[in-house]
């Protein structure tokens, strides 16, 4: 395990195993223990939570977090100003919208204040860590006797998102799913009027504006068919 310690000006100092170089393996002390990994997620580019598993520390420890942006105008080291807590100790940091710069390299440093040399630094590409809010306002339109169109809205730039639609009837054991590009609409060409359908959608910040792997939560489901289709056969937007 090699750990790269970064300084705000971009200089890199590579050390091994968190300063284990002079310590014999039979007397490893608490000061040499690796710090927990920091995981950051940017929620709809409104705020970002950077969290760590505080219980991986050998004893309750208020770890501190600093951050900066590498090789940019924002390379000044910033202290976390809004810590998240678990069992009364720090377990994360929340950054607000004005502190988020998606397309600059984000550098985050975790440190044990009781052992200042015990620190770990990570570099993150925030555009790959965006998680949008779940799609909203799902609506169904009957385009023809056997064709349905599903539409939805996202509280974000639509062209940045791809979507996954899942649907099933009350006769199905599993979902059928279909990928949808940034157009946020989906057509089902062949609908059986005797069956009740359920649709749901989730979205991802990929591939045009970032390469995020994490999907949003699923939308609230929307239903169509059998016992409800008689009420309004051409428009249905019930949220369960």
């Amino acid at each position: 395990l090699n750990t790269t310690i970064l300084t705000p000006n971009g200089n890199e100092d590579t050390t091994a195993d968190f300063f284990l170089t002079t310590m014999p393996t039979d007397s490893l002390s608490v000061s040499t223990l690796p710090l927990p990994e920091v995981q950051c997620f940017v929620f709809n580019v409104e705020y970002m939570n950077c969290t760590w598993n505080s219980s991986s520390e050998p004893q309750p420890t208020n770890l501190t977090l600093h951050y900066w942006y590498k090789n940019s105008d924002n390379d000044k080291v910033q202290k976390c100003s809004h810590y998240l807590f678990s069992e009364e100790i720090t377990s994360g940091c929340q950054l607000q919208k004005k502190e988020i710069h998606l397309y600059q390299t984000f550098v985050v440093q975790l440190q044990d204040p009781r052992e200042p040399r015990r620190q770990a630094t990570q570099m993150l590409k925030l555009q790959n860590l965006v998680i949008p809010w779940a799609p909203e306002n799902l609506t169904l339109h009957k385009l023809s006797e056997s064709q349905l169109e599903l539409n939805w809205n996202n509280r974000f730039l639509n062209h940045c998102l791809e979507h996954l639609v899942q649907y099933r009837t009350d006769w199905d054991h599993s979902w059928t799913e279909q990928s949808v590009d940034y157009r946020h609409k989906f057509s089902l060409p062949s609908v059986d009027g005797q069956k009740r359908y359920t649709f749901r959608v989730r979205s991802r910040f990929n591939p045009l504006c970032g390469s995020a792997q994490h999907w949003s939560e699923w939308s609230h489901p929307i239903h169509w068919g059998s016992n409800t289709s008689k009420e309004n056969p051409f428009l249905f937007a019930l949220e369960a």
Epitope: L28, S29, V30, L33, S55, P58, Q59, P60, E87, E88
Partner: antibody
Framework: QVQLVQSGAEVKKPGASVKVSCKAS????????MHWVRQAPGQGLEWMGW????????NYAKRFQGRVTMTRDTSITTAYMELIRLRSDDTAVYYC????????????WGRGTLVTVSS | EIVLTQSPGTLSLSPGERATLSCRAS???????LAWYQQKPGQAPRLLIY???SRATGIPDRFSGSGSGTDFTLTISRLEPEDFAVYYC?????????FGQGTKVEIK
């Protein structure tokens, strides 16, 4: 089932060493710190130190530093506690205790190993 | 090092009675980091209470913990025959982990 099984009782002479084992089963051995606690006859509980099986890092109580070594063998999910230069006042039951994965208390204990130091 | 002092040393009570055990710390302990253990002769300690007041899995609700700062209490509302044992408090908020010297609850 989740358990810690310790090695059997030992009788040692002053100045000798003892190595107690603690076999973990039923959970992810490397995911929990393992602590060692001892109890002299008729006395209370005394914390000795911990080992983090994932990395092998250790931390010992001051009074045992230089005499105690905690190790582990992840391939057989077993932790060890070795105490050297034994004295008669080291006669005690030695327990391994698993630290909870979400906090710092001990949620699982071995049944203990009695070590008797006598000339 | 935080020193924990338990009182009384021995508590003589009858089944059905209420037991109140005290644990006092030499300096403030966050209530998140105080535990109580029960130990019967020839057995390992068993976790009863963590975080000063949360019952461990499988522990009957006649056991309850309370307190904060330097004063903590374990209460057994109605003693059952199997509750007669030694009880230890422990702080796990700072190294070294320390235990009280124990309170023995014996049958009167």
């Amino acid at each position: 089932q989740v358990q810690l099984v310790q090695s059997g009782a030992e009788v040692k002479k002053p100045g000798a060493s003892v190595k107690v084992s603690c076999k973990a089963s039923g959970y992810t051995f490397t995911g929990h710190y393992m602590h060692w606690v001892r109890q002299a006859p008729g006395q209370g509980l005394e914390w000795m130190g911990w080992i983090y099986p994932h990395s092998g890092h250790t931390n010992y109580a001051k009074r045992f530093q230089g005499r105690v070594t905690m190790t582990r063998d992840t391939s057989i999910t077993t932790a060890y506690m070795e105490l050297i230069r034994l004295r008669s006042d080291d006669t005690a039951v030695y327990y391994c205790a698993r630290r909870s994965g979400r906090s710092w208390y001990f949620d699982l204990w071995g049944r203990g190993t009695l070590v008797t130091v006598s000339s | 090092e935080i020193v924990l002092t338990q009182s009384p040393g021995t508590l003589s009570l009858s089944p059905g009675e209420r037991a109140t055990l005290s644990c006092r710390a030499s300096q403030s302990v966050s209530s998140s980091y105080l535990a109580w253990y029960q130990q019967k002769p020839g057995q390992a300690p068993r976790l009863l209470i963590y975080g000063a007041s949360s019952r461990a899995t499988g522990i009957p609700d006649r056991f309850s913990g309370s307190g904060s700062g330097t004063d903590f209490t374990l209460t057994i509302s109605r003693l059952e025959p199997e509750d007669f044992a030694v009880y230890y408090c422990q702080q796990y908020g700072s190294s070294p982990w320390t235990f009280g010297q124990g309170t023995k609850v014996e049958i009167k």
